[in-house]
């Protein structure tokens, strides 16, 4: 059963490392993938002494942890690299951080999946 699923066809794209990676720095990324797989948007950023530095934004492959998330919200307590994903066109345009007292350390912070 899937309730109120919103298709993701495009996401805001940003790459702080754009010169080294030989990509655009910013834009809109169309999300491609197998027709039977879902697509999401993501954002990853750092908080350097209170200043937000976006690392990457773009499309994220089918991931059950992104299902039913209409907003891009990081809820982990004090991560090294902040990460959120969501469903819906350009849903990663805005992202936020609402820590919810997670006690565990993750196995690692997600990074952009290779295309």
């Amino acid at each position: 059963a899937i309730l109120g699923r919103s298709e993701t066809q495009e996401c805001l794209f940003f790459n702080a490392n754009w010169e080294k990676d030989r990509t655009n720095q910013t834009g809109v990324e169309p999300c491609y993938g197998d027709k039977d797989k879902r697509r999401h948007c993501f954002a990853t950023w750092k908080n350097i002494s209170g200043s937000i530095e976006i690392v990457k934004q773009g499309c994220w492959l089918d991931d059950i942890n992104c299902y039913d998330r209409t907003d891009c919200v990081e809820k982990k307590d004090s991560p090294e690299v902040y990460f959120c994903c969501c469903e819906g066109n350009m849903c990663n345009e805005k992202f936020s951080y609402f820590p919810q007292m997670e006690v565990t350390q993750p196995t690692s912070n997600p990074v952009t999946p290779k295309p």
Epitope: D62, Y67, E102
Partner: antibody, heavy 118, light 111 residues
Amino acid sequence: EVQLLESGGGLVQPGGSLRLSCAASGFTFRNSAMSWVRQAPGKGLEWVSGISVTGGSTFYTDSVKGRFTVSRDNSRNTLYLQMNSLRAEDTAVYYCAKVYYYSFFDYWGQGTLVTVSS
Amino acid sequence: QTVVTQEPSFSVSPGGTVTLTCGFNSGSVSTSYWPSWYQQTPGQAPRTLIYNTNTRSSGVPDRFSGSILGNKAALTITGAQADDESDYYCVLWMGSGIWVFGGGTKLTVLG
């Protein structure tokens, strides 16, 4: 420390019902997708069911569709598996597992044994 | 129906290297299936070794590594030790809420 504690297993007759619970602690339960995986005696692991962070999306392996229902209570940090019309082939240890980004199982419970027999 | 295949059994000498593979009947395994690997000893819950093809889970020694070899996912154990004797399972994320486990490989460390 992440802990997943399954309960509710036991002996049940074919056609009967059981409800498994998985009490979660040590992480933000409402921010994690969850799953059930089972293992029949002497056999391999088999994915049974998965559920999204809100509970709005639920998924099942073909052999349990229409008989099993996965649900979650985010206010109680608990995952459930309602099992109806049980068959002998459902006999297994049932594990609950936390799912992390990249859709993998990063933490596992110790399992609860379900035996379906007359 | 998707079937994920693993070698049923494998043997390795202590200190040796072994590569276990994970394929499926619907084509090639790629990183988009986010292959993950789990170790299980009898009577115990599974332990997560590798996720996202090649990322080691926390606390897993670097003797364990994951990769794509040809059209399959692979788990390589270098410098095998006696306590590596276990069952190893690969899992493929098929997307749209579905996972498929391989049948498992029983690894024997000789001697």
